[in-house]
């Protein structure tokens, strides 16, 4: 175009519907110029105007010829332009921030603006740029893009931004612009102008302030603190660590903490100091709640449910910032909150939830929440299967009879719909405890009763009880122990009885043993002894316990002696024994040796012995009647070990084995023996009966049984040359090759002739006895042989 004609035609649109075209006027033209603008379209359109721009409806795709005729005082000039959408620029109108507000507690800015979408014909994507500036110097803090869509109507947009610095610390400015990314427009697209700026500031009072206050943040986060002050701030510390100051407007300063460490439970102080003062805030750095661990729900009483859990990792937040828990039951919609006052016991938290009528299945969700986040755990329980009964209380024992008792106890709760399995521990003194399981129907009123039989009369029992439900979840704790003595019953057996004739053979002495407690069935008060023959029965006076012996004057006829034990309830069956022994002529005395503690006796089975066997023993050296003790063994036995605290090593005892038939006893074997053999305590006394030139005759005596201390097995006789009162070695000293030893194993031998000796020579003689328990001491003598004749 010529300079004297309109030139530099440019078209822009702000809404894609109208193009605003403008051009430069021909040089030299003044105010009074008119223009004719013709657009070569399907229809030829011309417009008369007095200004250098024209708004035309947006042209569809393609090239259009635009003729601009300039009419002025000194003539006219015409310019032709080709116009295409591609030459048109899309520049949106300058946006306007409708509202900028702040939440100072969260340091968040809230922005509100209108996209004026109603003026656009198509749906288009819009890119917004939001600029955040800080301080009076308007330092750029953040430039963000935000995408929206135009949808044919005016839409209000909201955007928020959380500042890393508390908003109180400095003035914050915000401005926005937009860019319409229309797919239907092929021309140039450009950013709008920036909106008029809006700002947010905090109006300080005269007091110095530190921000943020009481902030709770995640461990490892970064955080900015500031001090709004009229006086110069000299230093800042977190805990006791100095931090570099960041200068803001005026005397205001900030500090930035990176990767903050976990706080003490009371928080961490952030302190700013001035010449004369100190100002602080507290930061609580911790963790969001961990997922509640080991959530478990049970009931003690089917009235309320107890849910327990472990909080997991500690949050380091306490007091008002501590984790709060809510237990929600989803079927009923009911919930309970955990009160912080209910401090956890041993790291485990618990909540009670009231059971709901006719609801057995509960779906619990435990929500954990603190200022840093939330978490949850869920559990589905059939509560009838999760009964952990209370400890049974008011546990009582009452007698039914001598072998049965009634146990009662209290178990709080409404258990009408379930059965209990209860375990009763029964302990007899000094014996192993027994456990019995009983199934009991649950009741509403909490009182339970059970009968316990198969007990022993007159026995001290200790009872305790615990219960679980039949479906078994947990045993209750054991109840308190209750000690109880069952009532007496008639003694179940007669006493173990034996008899001996007195040494003069005129009196029969009857002995019996106290009944063991499990047969006495009570405290034995007395004994009745009676004596009967074919002609008569004679009863002795009642013999009070603890006397266990009676003497009756009897002739040598056969009598049956009866002994009956009596307690407060009644009398035992009689124990019967014949006064006379069944004779046995075919008896030899045998030797037996024990095993240190006792002695094993064996015998052959005898089918004639129908009642029992009795082993009787006594100390051999004691006078008649020979009775130390006796032991009864069943008739089918062929051996027994006799043990007694009274047995001593080296003491000889007589043992007698009797067999019984029809209450009469026959002596089957007679034995002498030792529990343990020892060496003799003395040497045999010996004398020289005769001396010749070449021989000596020695004679010795028996060693008394008490000193022998075992069965005599032989003698050791030593002889050799030797003189009294000389330094020559004694016979038994080692290393002598001229000493001779004779081992005499024939214990009936009482003399010994030593031959082949030298005449008129002194000999040293030594004699020792030995048993299987060892060799006894020595007895020695010096003898001089006669001179050879």
């Amino acid at each position: 175009q010529k300079k004297g004609a309109p030139h530099d035609l440019k078209c822009v649109t702000n809404n894609l519907q109208v193009w605003d075209c403008y051009w430069k006027a021909p040089s030299g033209t003044g105010r009074g110029t008119d223009y004719e603008v013709c657009i070569e379209n399907r229809s030829h359109s011309c417009y008369q105007l007095e200004k250098t721009n024209i708004k035309i409806p947006a042209l569809s795709h393609g090239d259009y010829e635009i003729t601009i005729n300039s009419l002025h005082d000194f003539g006219s000039s015409t310019s032709k332009f080709t116009l295409n959408e591609q030459n048109v620029s899309l520049i949106p109108d300058t946006p306007e921030i409708l509202n900028l507000s702040a939440d100072f507690s969260t340091s968040t800015l809230y922005l509100k603006w209108n996209d004026r979408g109603s003026v656009f014909p198509h749906h288009s994507n819009v890119i917004w740029e939001i600029k955040i500036l800080r301080k009076e110097s308007m330092e750029l803090v953040k430039l963000v893009t935000h995408n929206t869509t135009l949808n044919g109507k005016d839409t209000l947009h909201h955007w928020s931004w959380a500042s890393d610095m508390p908003l109180e610390c400095a003035i914050h400015f915000v401005e926005i612009r937009c860019y319409i990314d229309s797919l239907h427009f092929s021309g140039r697209k450009e950013w709008s102008d920036w909106s008029p700026v809006k700002n947010i500031s905090w109006m300080p009072d005269s007091q110095t302030k530190v921000f943020p206050q009481d902030k709770v943040i995640l461990v490892g986060s970064d955080i900015t603190f500031c001090c709004i002050s009229q006086e110069k701030v000299l230093s800042a510390l977190i805990g006791h660590t100095n931090c570099p100051l960041i200068h803001l407007d005026g005397e205001n300063v900030a500090i930035k903490i990176h990767n903050i460490s976990v706080s003490a439970s009371s928080g961490t102080n952030v302190v700013f100091t001035t010449e004369d003062n100190i100002f602080g805030t507290v930061i609580f750095a911790g963790y969001p709640p961990d997922t509640p661990q080991q959530l478990n729900c049970e009931t003690h009483d089917l009235k309320e449910i107890l849910c327990r859990w472990n909080p997991g990792r500690a949050t380091a937040l306490v007091g008002p910032r501590a984790t709060s828990y809510t237990l929600l039951e989803s079927f009923s919609g009911k919930y309970v909150r955990f009160k912080r006052a209910e401090a956890p016991t041993n790291g485990s938290y618990q909540l009670f939830f009231q059971m709901l009528p006719n609801q057995e299945i509960y779906n619990f969700t435990l929500n954990a929440h603190n200022p840093l986040g939330r978490s949850e755990s869920t559990i589905l329980v059939n509560i009838t299967e999760k009964v952990y009964p209370h400890t049974p209380t008011s546990f009582k024992v009452k007698d039914i009879n001598s072998t049965a008792v009634k146990l009662s106890w209290h178990l709080p709760g409404n258990f009408a719909k379930i059965n209990f399995l209860c375990q009763i521990e029964i302990k007899k003194s000094n014996t192993v405890q027994e456990q019995r399981n009983v199934t009991i129907k649950g009741v509403e009123n909490s009182s339970y009763l059970v009968a316990l039989d198969k007990l022993n009369p007159y026995t001290v029992y200790t009872f305790r009880i615990r219960c679980s439900t039949e479906t078994f979840w947990k045993w209750s704790k054991w109840s308190n122990k209750k000690q109880h003595l069952t009532t007496e019953a008639i003694p179940s057996k007669g006493p173990d009885t034996w008899r001996e004739w007195s040494s003069d053979g005129k009196n029969l002495i009857i002995y019996w043993k106290p009944l063991p407690i499990n047969e006495a069935n009570g405290k034995i008060l007395s004994y009745n002894v009676s004596c009967s023959s074919d002609e008569e029965t004679q009863s002795l006076s009642e013999i009070p316990d603890p006397q266990h012996k009676a003497e009756i004057q009897l002739d040598k006829n056969d009598y049956i002696i009866s002994v009956v034990a009596k307690n407060s309830v009644g009398s035992s069956p009689p124990s019967k024994i014949a006064s006379m022994e069944i004779p046995n002529d075919d008896l030899k005395i045998e030797q037996v040796v024990g095993m240190g503690k006792g002695i094993l006796l064996t015998w052959h089975y005898d089918p004639n012995m129908t009642c029992d066997y009795v082993i009787k023993w006594c100390n051999s050296s004691r006078s008649e009647p020979c009775l130390m003790d006796w032991r009864k063994v069943p008739s089918n036995s062929t051996e027994t070990v006799i043990e007694s605290d009274q047995f001593r090593p080296g003491v000889r005892y007589n043992f007698f084995l009797y067999g019984c038939r029809n209450q009469g006893y026959q002596l089957l074997r007679s034995m002498i023996g030792y529990i343990e053999e020892l060496a003799p305590t003395v040497a045999p006394n010996f004398t020289v009966e005769d001396t010749s030139a070449d021989s000596i005759l020695v004679k010795w005596e028996d060693i008394p049984v008490e000193e022998l201390r075992g069965f005599l097995r032989g003698y050791l006789f030593y002889f050799g040359k030797g003189e009294r009162d000389t330094s020559k070695m004694r016979v038994l000293e080692s290393g002598r090759s001229d000493i001779k030893v004779k081992n005499i194993t024939d214990i009936s031998q009482k003399t010994l002739r030593i031959a082949d000796l030298q005449g008129k020579t002194s000999y040293h003689l030594v004699l020792r006895a030995y048993t299987d328990g060892g060799v006894g001491p020595e007895k020695s003598m010096y003898v001089v042989t006669k001179e050879n004749s």
């Epitope: 706080s263 302190v271 004369d276 100002f279 602080g280 507290v282 008002p320």
Partner: antibody, heavy 125, light 108 residues
């Protein structure tokens, strides 16, 4: 157990000086900020001064600024208050008090716990 | 400086009753920086509550603290004979550290 024992109180004439001491035991003295608090007869509590755990920073109430000096000797576990130019209105029981939490744990602004039994200062002509 | 006001000045109650003591600040105080002390005649003050609501070691749970901003409360749920004393609130968040004038709890 933690103990604070004040000493040095007494009767003094206006304009004169007095030095109070506070002997600390049962804790790591060098880890705690320390304070002086006073209580005029029949009146409430008035904070007087604080000194940081390391002795580097000291702060005072306006009523004593320029006249009183707080100091500490961490080797002797002792806190001091040097009181100069005493006035009748300084008459009070003077308590020393420890920060309730160690500076190493929580930092430098804390509640006061425990307190000493107090020492009476009487300023009178 | 932050001025603390306590009310009432005197509270006359009987043992077993509930006591509610108020402390108001002239400007906002961080709840982390508010403490309550008890003082009996002839004795040094004793810390009850710190951080507005945390009970000090050995303090019975009948004592509780609450509040934020400018209004704080000390509650004694059931007064015991040994609780009759003067109670002071204190802010320790900025110097000068200030105490309230005290509330005297006496036996009715």
């Amino acid at each position: 157990q933690v103990q604070l024992v004040e000493s040095g109180g007494g009767v003094v004439q206006p304009g004169r000086s007095l030095r109070l001491s506070c002997a600390a035991s049962g804790f790591t003295f060098s880890s705690y900020g320390m304070h002086w608090v006073r209580q005029a007869p029949g009146k409430g509590l008035e904070w007087v001064a604080v000194i940081w755990y390391d002795g580097n920073n000291k702060y005072y109430a306006d009523s004593v600024k320029g006249r009183f000096t707080i100091s500490r000797d961490n080797s002797k576990n002792t806190l001091y208050l040097q009181m100069n130019s005493l006035r009748a209105e300084d008459t009070a029981v003077y308590y020393c008090a420890r920060d309730g939490e160690s500076s190493m744990v929580r930092g430098l602004l804390n509640w006061f716990d425990p307190w000493g039994q107090g020492t009476l200062v009487t300023v009178s002509s | 400086e932050i001025v603390l006001t306590q009310s009432p000045g005197t509270l006359s109650l009987s043992p077993g009753e509930r006591a509610t003591l108020s402390c108001r600040a002239s400007q906002s105080v961080s709840s982390s920086y508010l403490a309550w002390y008890q003082q009996k005649p002839g004795q040094a003050p004793r810390l009850l509550i710190y951080g507005a609501s945390s009970r000090a070691t050995g303090i019975p749970d009948r004592f509780s603290g609450s509040g934020s901003g400018t209004d704080f409360t000390l509650t004694i749920s059931r007064l015991e004979p040994e609780d009759f004393a003067v109670y002071y609130c204190q802010q320790y968040g900025s110097s000068p550290f200030t105490f309230g004038p005290g509330t005297k709890v006496d036996i009715k």
